[in-house]
């Protein structure tokens, strides 16, 4: 008589999260009389999957009617396969007794879980830095596999080198996560840049994930500023202008000294955007040139986006 | 052909034993388990006791643990049954019967019967 | 123990009536029960096994249905051959046991 084998043809099938799993088993003999169980692992720790004799397993579906007499077709379905479901699944033929006892187990069939990534996430420096400095962004992406990925980052559509990149766990796992970090070396015209972190992935059919950051978010560009004096008006009064250019982010504050006394302080408010998305701001101050019997020192002190203030002084002649 | 044969009536005293055998043809003998049922006369079907013809392993009702006995012989493909210290309401006829199930436990081929008289 | 509750124990009907039983068991057995039919001085024969599955070379007049604890067996339209007792049985787990039988009488 022909002995009883266990019989799983395929060695490995590989299943997208979300859909269903047909894991395939045949026995070549009904007898000896005796369920089939399906397990995933070896050993004392194996995890029962399904059990032909009892139990409830909401996900498992058997391929073919297990109450019929002459079945020995046992394979299952599993339904909704996440990640978690990854592993090596074994079709064992048992006999019975008191208890049941194992008889002969089929090869396994390894499931592994195609997973997406999650869309990127780029993340900035936690503070502003200013032109010619290098900043770090970071980029994650979690919850893939297989675990072979790829990651670019692009700054203004013009692919970057300078990037470390990380894929855990290094061993086997259920699934997996990206990080990758990339030194940005910033200009004065960033303020409109973007970087870009771009993930390839086996399950995302040639369609890349990408996550962006803009770098308005990490960069401080410090102003210009020029102080000048406009002619002499009939009424003995001088205007003068505080010019502070090319600045962002918009949060400046402006105060005038006259000779060391703050006359007046301003905020910044709605102010129109220049084409390299920086700010220009004018300030005027009149000076009664009259109330005065020396020379009058103005100074313009810009303290911006919390930077220490940056004075530019002008002194106005009182001709005696 | 598939079939169980049972051997012949016995008619047994008070405190005396039994042993009533089954054997199979027509089919693979190890491959299966035997349970034994018995009936009193004008009563319903009583489950006595399993027994697994590929490995010997046993299990009994209850009420009969220490007084029944299973066996197999798988060179001739006979199941036996032994039951000690006969009484009068063992009096009954004594069923093999194939399980067939693979999960679950039924009876898809039966012997004849035997019937066991207890009297004095 | 489980226990196998049959129901009714006896019923008279005539050829062609459609006769229900029905079988209850104490807790739940799943599928795992099969129907038996047994006629006078002879040994029962399997009808129905796992709860609704024909036994090879039994007429479909017989049917089997439920799960859990609640079952039932159906002869559509009984014929001069089916008068006879009828037994479940249930198969989860040892030790197994039997209704008290339902015998088929003719009216």
């Known amino acids: 008589e022909e002995e009883l084998q266990v019989i799983q043809p395929e060695k490995s099938v590989s299943v997208a999260a979300g859909e269903s799993a047909t894991l395939n088993c045949t026995a070549t003999s009904l007898i000896p009389v005796g369920p089939i169980q399906w397990f995933r692992g070896v050993g004392p720790g194996r995890e029962l999957i399904y059990s032909q004799k009892e139990g409830h397993f909401p996900r498992v579906t058997p391929v073919s009617d297990p109450t019929k007499r002459n079945n020995m077709d046992f394979s299952i379905r599993i339904s909704n396969i996440t990640p978690a479901d990854a592993g090596t699944y074994y079709c064992v033929k048992f006999r019975k007794g008191s208890p049941d006892v194992e008889l002969k187990s089929g090869a396994g069939t390894e499931l592994s879980v195609r997973a997406k990534p999650s869309a990127p996430v780029v993340s900035g420096p936690a503070v502003r830095a200013t032109a010619e400095h290098t900043v770090s962004f970071t980029c994650e992406s979690h919850g893939f596999s297989p675990r072979d990925i790829t990651l670019k980052w692009f700054k203004n559509g013009n692919e970057l080198s300078d990037f470390q990149t990380n894929v855990d766990p290094a061993g086997k796992s259920v699934s997996y996560s990206i990080r990758s970090t990339a030194r940005v070396v910033l200009t004065r015209r960033d303020v409109h840049s973007q970087v870009i972190c771009e993930v390839a992935h086996v399950t995302l059919q040639g369609d890349p994930l990408r996550g962006t950051a803009n770098l308005s978010e990490a960069i401080r560009v410090p102003p210009f500023l020029e102080v000048t004096q406009q002619s002499m008006r009939a009424d003995n009064q001088v205007n003068v202008t505080c010019q502070v250019t090319k600045f962002y982010p918009q949060r400046l504050q402006l105060t005038w000294l006259e000779n060391g006394n703050v006359s007046r302080t301003e905020m910044a408010s709605a102010l129109p955007e220049n084409k390299d998305g920086t700010y220009n701001w004018t300030s005027w101050l009149l000076v009664n040139v009259s109330a005065h019997r020396d020379d009058v020192k103005l100074t313009c002190q810009v303290e911006h986006d919390g930077q220490p203030a940056v004075n530019k002084s002008f002194s106005v002649k009182v001709s005696a | 052909q598939v079939q169980l044969v049972q051997s012949g009536a016995e008619v047994k005293k008070p405190g005396a034993s039994v042993k009533v055998s089954c054997k199979a043809s027509?089919?693979?003998?190890?491959?299966?388990?035997i349970s034994w049922v018995r009936q009193a006369p004008g009563q319903g079907l009583e489950w006595m006791g399993w027994?697994?013809?590929?490995?010997?392993?046993?299990n009994y009702a209850q009420k009969l643990q220490g007084r029944v006995t299973m066996t197999t012989d798988t060179s001739t493909s006979t199941a036996y049954m032994e039951l000690r210290s006969l009484r009068s309401d063992d009096t009954a006829v004594y069923y093999c019967?194939?399980?067939?199930?693979?999960?679950?436990?039924?009876?898809?081929?039966w012997g004849r019967g035997t019937l066991v008289t207890v009297s004095s | 123990d489980i226990q196998m509750t049959q129901s009714p124990s006896s019923v008279s009907a005539s050829v062609g009536d459609r006769v229900t039983i029905t079988c209850r068991a104490s807790?739940?057995?799943?599928?795992?029960l099969a129907w038996y039919q047994q006629k006078p001085g002879k040994a029962p024969k399997l009808l129905i096994y796992?709860?609704?599955n024909l036994q090879s070379g039994v007429p479909s007049r017989f049917s089997g249905s439920g799960s859990g604890t609640d079952f039932t067996l159906t002869i559509s339209s009984l014929q001069p051959e089916d008068f006879a007792t009828y037994y479940c049985?249930?198969?989860?787990?040892?030790?197994?046991?039997f209704g008290g039988g339902t015998k088929v009488e003719i009216k």
């Open positions: 807790q739940g057995i799943s599928s795992w």
């Open positions: 019967a194939r399980e067939a199930g693979s999960s679950w436990y039924d009876f898809d081929l």
């Open positions: 796992a709860a609704s």
């Open positions: 049985q249930q198969g989860a787990s040892f030790p197994i046991t």
């Open positions: 027509g089919y693979t003998f190890g491959g299966y388990g």
């Open positions: 027994i697994s013809a590929y490995g010997g392993e046993t």
